[in-house]
């Protein structure tokens, strides 16, 4: 019998303890928000917010500018000063709750926990390849705002998500805020609203449209807004909230809320329950039919997918897909099965399900007993009636009122439970060549870059490395700048190449040369490396 090379086990062909050092920035405090800007002319910036301060970094993560955003009432607060002589409210630290780009101006908008959740607009001023912030404009007109009606009160101390959409000659802010009774009583930011930025940057236009958790439900019914994004004709919010207004408030599930990005109206506000499950290939005795539910969304990101994953999801290459990391409960603690699962929801399918739900509610014959839902926002009613009414009047349309779609959208873990004990805390998905890669941050401060495929019984790693020595959780929000992703962990911002930090973790030549083309790996004497690391021979074609 012919002698054959002993086969190296797949796991032994890589070493995830290899240290990679990636560029980083120490922010001087826990990073609260981060956003990136890439201009038309090669200028770019990273904006990093910590308590009472906003940093402007160049693309090399070197500090360009720093601005004091608090404490409110402190003479050193540079943003507060934009609102004229104070006092403007109770003194206190400013935690940044919103940091978004208004691409139409372009400008950076920051909103904090202090000063009634007001926002500040910072025009971007390019200087070479760097960007500076102009003097802030205070988006607050005192005479327009009252505790019960405050167009300029945007951020909630409990959390706010904002997506900015340009419509016509204005920027519309799609805002979703977590509320409780105390927050709602003091300059209520509302749960969901669409606000038009005034042309003179003095605040937001009055008379904005909004939905809010009804006062009677504020104590028991809390909505966490996990993510928001704009694609195609819609803006989407992802929420974690109690499954029912009347039942146990600790029984949570995940919903997608859809709003029109072309009409600043809330009549076509729709919600759909997202159901993510772990369905092991061999079902254990006692395991639930259809798989184990993972009802709580932890992080999400939407991205167009590469050819291979598109085929597996039965959609076209390049179509937008919403990816979510789900856990079993708020604490994300261990249960049977993996700690985190990843589910994929094609956006076109989500839209189709929503549209079908509207048809079921509004097109006769309507199934008797079908509820409009969203009883935490509006009076209970049955389809096709408007909220709180027994019947449709001739001049109202069933479609012009918010609706919870009666069916849910169910998917199973793309990774087949292979994430195991890993607790994923951050997610960003990119398409590289025809490959779709999930870039994940973890509870213990690691980065996992893994190809998204569902047909395998092992994970295809681009990389798996530790960001630093602190082991602090990687934060939820990830930003892209060119060919890099920016992750925050503790008080640090790290810049990770989307094609991976390097190739040294591939231990064998065979494994090295089988790495994805985009990684640029080659065999370099006795190690796997990128060409720039190799002064001598570098081989991508065959092993010695």
């Amino acid at each position: 019998e012919d002698w054959q090379c002993p086969r190296t086990p797949y796991a032994a062909s890589r070493d995830f303890d290899v240290k990679y050092v990636v560029p980083s920035f120490s922010a001087g405090g826990l990073v609260q928000a981060m956003v990136t800007y890439e201009g038309d002319r090669n200028e770019s910036a990273v904006f990093v917010a910590i308590r009472n301060r906003l940093h402007v970094l160049g693309p090399d993560l070197k500090s360009v500018q720093s601005l004091a955003t608090g404490p409110a009432g402190d003479p050193g607060c540079q943003t507060c000063a934009a609102c004229g002589p104070g006092p403007h409210g109770p003194p206190g630290d400013t935690d940044t709750k919103v940091l978004v780009l208004d691409p139409a101006l372009p400008a950076l908008v920051s909103c904090g926990s202090s000063l009634q959740g007001r926002c500040f607009l910072h025009d971007l001023e390019p200087q070479g390849t760097a960007v500076h912030l102009a003097a802030p404009a205070c988006l607050f007109s005192a005479h327009h705002n009252r505790p019960d009606d405050c167009p300029d009160c945007v951020a909630s101390p409990l959390g706010t998500r904002v997506t900015v959409v340009e419509q016509g000659q204005a920027s519309y802010f799609y805002v979703a805020s977590s509320l409780d009774a105390a927050v709602a009583a003091s300059f209520s930011p509302r749960s969901v609203s669409i606000r038009r930025l005034k042309a003179d940057a003095s605040g937001f236009a009055p008379g904005f449209v909004a939905l809010s958790v009804l006062p009677k439900h504020l104590v028991s019914y809390s909505i966490e807004y996990v993510h928001s994004f704009h694609t195609g004709a819609f803006v989407y919010f992802l929420t974690v909230q109690p499954a029912s207004v009347t039942d146990d408030p600790s029984a949570l599930h995940t919903r997608l809320a859809r709003l029109s990005a072309t009409e600043p109206e809330l009549g076509d506000y729709r919600e759909l329950v997202l159901d993510c499950r772990f369905a092991p290939k061999r079902r254990r005795r006692g395991a639930p039919e259809g798989g184990q539910p993972y009802p709580v969304l932890r992080v999400a990101h939407s991205a167009p997918v590469g050819a291979q994953l598109a085929t597996e999801l039965s959609i076209a290459e390049g179509q937008e897909v919403l990816f979510g990391v789900f856990v079993t409960g708020k604490d994300g603690g261990p249960g049977v099965g993996p700690n985190s699962v990843v589910c994929a929801f094609p956006i076109d399918l989500l839209d189709t399900l929503i549209d079908e739900g509207v048809e079921r509610c509004c097109e006769s014959p309507v199934h008797p007993g079908l509820r409009r839902g969203l009883d935490f926002f509006q009076s209970p009613s049955f389809c096709p009636n408007p909220p709180g009414l027994e019947a449709l009047s001739p001049n109202t349309s069933c479609r012009h009122f918010p609706l919870l779609v009666s069916s849910s959208f169910s998917r199973v873990d793309l990774f087949n439970g292979l994430l195991g004990p890993v607790q994923v805390t951050a997610l960003y998905v990119t398409r590289l060549d025809n490959v779709t890669v999930a870039h994940m941050g973890t509870m213990d401060g690691r980065i996992l870059q893994v190809e998204l495929v569902r047909s395998l019984n092992y994970l295809l790693y681009v990389s798996n490395f530790s960001l630093g020595d602190s082991g602090q959780p990687v934060q939820r929000d990830v930003s892209r700048l060119g060919d890099h992703l920016l992750f925050a962990s503790g008080d640090q911002v790290f810049q990770v190449p989307i094609q991976g930090p390097g190739c040294r973790h591939f231990l064998t030549c065979g494994r090295c040369l089988r790495a994805w083309h985009f990684m640029g790996c080659g065999w370099c004497g006795n190690m796997c490396g990128q060409q720039k690391e190799c002064p001598g021979s570098w081989q991508q074609d065959h092993c010695p």
Epitope: A104, E166, Q167, T262
Partner: antibody
Framework: QIQLQQSGPELVKPGTSVKISCKAS????????MNWVRQKPGQGLEWIGR????????RYNEKFRDKAILTVDTSSSTAYMQLSSLTSEDTAVYFC??????????????WGQGTSVTVSL | DIQMTQSPASQSASLGESVTITCLAS??????LAWYQQKPGKSPQLLIY???SLADGVPSRFSASGSGTKFSFKIDSLQSEDFVSYYC?????????FGGGTKLEIK
């Protein structure tokens, strides 16, 4: 009634600059955006950019960012567009046009009569 | 940038007939669309805003429909002064863009 009165035709040499004006009457200039639009001979319309006279904030079509500078003089209710480094490709009629809200929507509801700019040796 | 494709580029019709012009947007723009008429040597004049609403003083023989990416503009009972050029324009995202125009000619 509302009018936008533009300056007269210009015959200019290549490489030079020209500044054309648009005087607004019967409305408050600072309350509405002012847009500028180009129409080359025998061709369609191209949006150059807009300015909000209340704050001097501008928004340009990237194609014209190095070509046009929009300004206003609120004291005379006049908007200006300066075109620089002129070539024969810049020969066109240039319109100013006010944009206004109609409910939630926007349209360019009043237009100047146009200023013809001819770039020639 | 959002591309606006207007067709036909030119159309011949007789007095009293109806004509329809279409405009396709390269991405959804809701109803952020306007239609303009331009007479030779003159500035454009607003006819339609918000895709379907008639501007003040515009005769009711002009009408328009559509939303999302597909829009149409119709003139009923053509009159001699209608044989000029027409443009659609999206005002959803900057840069605001126009269709290539349609020139109506008398048959």
């Amino acid at each position: 009634q509302i009018q936008l009165q533009q300056s007269g035709p210009e015959l200019v040499k290549p490489g030079t600059s020209v500044k054309i004006s648009c005087k607004a009457s019967d409305y408050t200039l600072t309350d509405f955006y002012m847009n500028w639009v180009r129409q080359k001979p025998g061709q369609g319309l191209e949006w150059i950019g807009r300015i909000y006279p209340g704050t001097d904030k501008t928004r340009y079509n990237e194609k014209f960012r190095d070509k046009a500078i929009l300004t206003v003089d609120t004291s005379s209710s006049t908007a200006y567009m300066q075109l620089s480094s002129l070539t024969s490709e810049d020969t066109a009629v240039y319109f100013c046009a006010r944009s206004a809200y109609y409910g939630n929507y926007v349209a360019m509801d009043y237009w100047g009569q146009g200023t013809s700019v001819t770039v020639s040796l | 940038d959002i591309q606006m494709t207007q067709s036909p580029a030119s159309q011949s019709a007789s007095l009293g007939e109806s004509v329809t012009i279409t405009c396709l947007a390269s991405q959804t723009i809701g109803t952020w669309l306007a239609w303009y008429q331009q007479k030779p040597g003159k500035s454009p004049q607003l006819l339609i805003y918000a895709a379907t609403s008639l501007a003040d003083g515009v005769p009711s023989r002009f009408s328009a429909s559509g939303s999302g990416t597909k829009f149409s503009f119709k003139i009923d009972s053509l009159q001699s002064e209608d044989f000029v050029s027409y443009y659609c324009q999206q005002l959803y995202n900057t840069p605001w863009t126009f269709g290539g125009g349609t020139k109506l000619e008398i048959k």
